[in-house]
């Protein structure tokens, strides 16, 4: 029998490499059974997670899962860092694992890496292929 506890499916050690100036959606996959929990995003500052007020968020509902999305429109250099989503469920606070955004400032990288650059710098290819991951259903 499946548990009806709320689950926040942010994977441990998850990372995203993104460019300043681009739009980006940070997804918190939320599983719940009956009433949708109240979910918030916070940004880690040392050991404290500072709640993100006045930020654009939205819900995307799918068949077996919902996504609470934090919108970056656009991404700014100081968006670099680690984020966590939290859900209030039956008086319990459930916290996700943290997910880290690595923001490349377009001023210091005046253009996106070319295919040749990606081939000669495999760590870039790894970051873009492996970390810049979205859920597709």
């Amino acid at each position: 029998k499946e548990s009806c506890d709320v689950q926040l499916y942010i994977k441990r050690q998850s990372e995203h490499s993104i460019l300043a100036g681009d739009p980006f959606e940070l997804e918190c996959p939320v599983k719940y059974c009956a009433n949708r929990p109240h979910v918030t995003w916070c940004k880690l500052n040392g050991t404290t997670c500072v709640k993100l007020e006045d930020r654009q968020t939205s819900w995307k509902e799918e068949k077996n899962i919902s996504f609470f999305i934090l919108h970056f429109e656009p991404v700014l250099p100081n968006d670099n860092g680690s984020y966590r989503c939290s859900a209030n469920f039956q008086s319990n606070l459930i916290e996700s694992h943290s997910t880290t955004l690595y923001v490349t400032d377009v001023k210091s990288a005046s253009e996106r890496p070319s295919k040749d650059e990606m081939a000669s710098r495999p760590w870039l290819l790894y970051r873009h292929h492996h970390h810049h991951h979205h859920h597709h259903h």
Partner: antibody
């Protein structure tokens, strides 16, 4: 009941590509949170984690072997496939697959029986 | 990479007596989420590994309570309160806090 079973060639030649299949039951990689890892163990030596694939096709690799590894899943067949290129005699090992989910608490809670792969000309 | 160092590498024990295995890591295994992803595996002769303990001290289902895990930060211990014949094998610690996940070199427990 969760079970995993590895299959593939027992002998490969140096420079060849190894393809191993992990067939599992009792859980599904279409379920949010699920994942499968590959781990190997050379004869008489310690374990080494190789690669992991999650339900959403996110993949993690051991950086020391990343350039040689590919991991894929076939959700409908309940299978995960590992390929390792340019095999060398030092890659002779028992290769295991094991289950592990997104939150770290069920990392490697179930293991396959392992399959011994010998690399020799 | 985080290096996991176990000691001793070989542990001859008397049936019914206690046994203790140490595992040290080169970095703290306390994660930012407050959990410590330090786990212990048992590998009996000719068998695949089996998870005994996860998150430092939580016993897997079916694991006898003579096994216990403790520790924090970089120093961890697996204890067997009274060794039985079926406990013979190699014990590995491994960490899932830092990427890539790494294992200790193993401790072989045998009966004197």
């Amino acid at each position: 009941q969760v079970t995993l079973k590895e299959s593939g060639p027992t002998l490969v030649k140096p420079t060849q590509t190894l393809t191993l299949t992990c067939t599992f039951s009792g859980f599904s990689l279409s379920t949010f949170g699920m994942g499968v890892s590959w781990i190997r163990q050379p004869p008489g030596k310690a374990l080494e984690w190789l690669a992991h694939i999650y339900w959403d096709d996110d993949k993690r690799f051991n950086p020391s072997l990343k350039s040689r590894l590919t991991i894929t899943k076939d959700t409908s067949k309940n299978q995960v496939v590992l390929t390792m290129t340019n095999m060398d005699p030092v890659d002779t090992a028992t290769y295991y697959c094991a289950r592990g989910n997104w939150d770290g608490e069920t990392y490697f809670d179930y293991w396959g029986q392992g399959t011994l792969v010998t690399v020799s000309s | 990479d985080v290096v996991m160092t176990q000691s001793p590498l070989s542990l001859p024990v008397t049936l019914g007596q206690p046994a203790s295995i140490s595992c040290k890591s080169t970095q703290s295994l306390l994660d930012s989420d407050g959990k410590t992803y330090l786990n212990w595996l048992q590998q009996r002769p000719g068998q695949s590994p089996r998870r005994l303990i996860y998150l430092v001290s939580k016993l897997d289902s079916g694991v006898p309570d003579r096994f216990s895990g403790s520790g924090s930060g970089t120093d961890f211990t697996l204890k067997i309160s009274r060794v039985e014949a079926e406990d013979v094998g190699v014990y590995y610690c491994w960490q899932g806090t830092h990427f890539p996940w790494t294992f200790g070199q193993g401790t072989k427990v045998e009966i004197k």
